[in-house]
């Protein structure tokens, strides 16, 4: 028996369902009574789901997993993981035994898009060219940690005097706060780009200072 899984990681959005694909080639005359299928976490060996002795033994992992029972006899040993959480991320091993045994591991990469950044300015009034201002770009509820880039109105990267902090909430999702300290010119636009490296998703925010008032 040869077990096959996708070599590329499976990318799943938080709160959606993911399918970890695994297949084997049944011999002629194969019946499910002969099959032992075990899904487990690769690193800790924690049991996730099993099918043994002709029976689906059910989920051993938060009751959020399921097999595709009608497809098992065709060699489809894929696992459905429902309502994906950040903590589900990692490597899963699909182990199949019939006459022989084999196993293969598939990686699950969890992702969540970042919200459109909100921009705040401090101070936010009586601004004059030459003033030092603090611009804060905040984006929420993303995963994994974001990459943050600042640019001026001409698209020139601003790398100095940038402080970025990312904090995970109780669900493991990150809120990102990036602070740019800059000396105001006569007028200008300052834009912040928050990138999710897994989804290759960019969220943009900008602030334009043209005397008074400010536009966001």
């Amino acid at each position: 028996v040869e077990v096959q899984v996708s070599e590329d990681p499976v990318v799943a959005l938080v709160d959606t369902d993911a399918t970890l694909r695994c297949s084997f080639s049944p011999e002629p005359g194969f019946s499910l009574a002969q099959l032992n299928l075990i899904w487990q976490l690769t690193d800790t060996k924690q049991l996730v789901h099993s099918f043994t002795e002709g029976r689906d033994q059910g989920s051993a992992y938060s009751n959020r997993t399921a097999l595709f029972p009608d497809l098992l006899v065709q060699g489809n040993a894929s696992l459905r993981l429902q309502r994906v959480r950040v903590t589900d991320e990692g490597s899963y091993t699909c182990f199949v035994s019939i006459q022989d045994f084999d196993s293969a591991a598939v990686s699950l990469q969890v992702a969540a898009p970042y919200s459109k950044p909100s921009m705040t300015l401090e101070p936010n009034k009586d601004l004059r060219p030459g003033n030092m201002v603090t611009i804060t770009c905040s984006s929420y509820q993303g995963y994994p940690e974001a990459e943050v880039f600042w640019k001026d109105g001409q698209g020139v990267p601003l790398t100095g005097n940038v402080t970025t902090s990312q904090m995970a909430n109780e669900r493991g999702l990150f809120d990102v706060h990036s602070v740019l300290r800059v000396v105001l010119g006569a007028n200008g636009t300052y834009s912040c780009l928050v990138r999710n490296p897994v989804l290759q998703q960019d969220a943009h925010g900008s602030v334009t200072i043209t005397g008074q008032p400010l536009t966001f």
Partner: antibody, heavy 120, light 110 residues
Framework: EVQLLESGGGLVQPGGSLRLSCAAS????????MTWVRQAPGKGLEWVAD????????LYADAVKGRFTISRDNSKNIVYLQMNSLRGEDTAVYYC?????????????WGQGTTVTVSS | QSVLTQPPSASGTPGQRVTISCSGV????????VHWYQQLPGTAPKLLIY???ERPSGVPDRFSGSTSGTSASLAISGLQSEDEADYYC???????????FGGGTKLTVL
């Protein structure tokens, strides 16, 4: 007649290495997963490692993981157990065994065993 | 990890029926299959019963296996002196813990 014959046991110092061999005959060796089981003096049976028919997938007991390596040569009908970083608690008779037609049904043919003694 | 518990010893007289228990058959993977091995003094183990009650060819029908709940039993009827041996139950824990053996029961024929 189906037969398994182990060899390679002996006396080795702690930290040393040894390679056990198990020569198979009388069955289609390349179609069956193989197992090593050990038995310390006066103790019970303890599973050590499994290898599937093609040799590409292996399983190990936690007690030997990272120190022992199971492998096979289907052209020679031999299964090996490479044992490194040996400890006193590895002292045992080592048996190789062939599985029934279904892997999870148990081991139906066993070798006579080879003795490994780890001592300084 | 599964721990299969067997009595360390059992005994009987020739012709008698003896039973050896194996408790703790609560596999995480859902497997309830138990296999039994006989090890005569100074020899390698031999498969006696597989899948709870099936006998490999060559094993006399005096040997029988059964299961109930989380326990398995090996029964030997018409006990003979050549049955004096160590008996081990075993179960398969898949990729999690591999093969798990009971501690063994030494059967003495009085």
């Amino acid at each position: 007649e189906v037969q398994l014959l182990e060899s390679g046991g002996g006396l080795v110092q702690p930290g040393g290495s040894l390679r056990l061999s198990c020569a198979a005959s009388g069955f289609t060796f390349s179609s069956y997963p193989m197992t090593w089981v050990r038995q310390a003096p006066g103790k019970g049976l303890e599973w050590v490692a499994d290898i599937n028919s093609g040799g590409g997938t292996t399983l190990y007991a936690d007690a030997v993981k990272g120190r022992f390596t199971i492998s096979r040569d289907n052209s020679k009908n031999i299964v090996y157990l490479q044992m490194n970083s040996l400890r006193g608690e590895d002292t045992a008779v080592y048996y190789c065994a062939k599985h029934l037609d279904y892997y999870s049904y148990g081991m139906d043919v066993w070798g006579q065993g080879t003795t490994v003694t780890v001592s300084s | 990890q599964s721990v299969l518990t067997q009595p360390p010893s059992a005994s009987g007289t020739p012709g008698q029926r003896v039973t050896i228990s194996c408790s703790g058959v609560t596999s995480k993977i859902g497997s309830k299959y138990v296999h039994w091995y006989q090890q005569l003094p100074g020899t390698a183990p031999k498969l006696l019963i597989y899948r709870n009650f099936e006998r490999p060819s060559g094993v006399p029908d005096r040997f029988s296996g059964s299961t109930s709940g989380t326990s398995a039993s090996l029964a030997i009827s018409g006990l003979q002196s050549e049955d004096e041996a160590d008996y081990y139950c075993a179960t398969w824990e898949g990729a999690l813990n591999g093969w798990v053996f009971g501690g063994g029961t030494k059967l003495t024929v009085l």
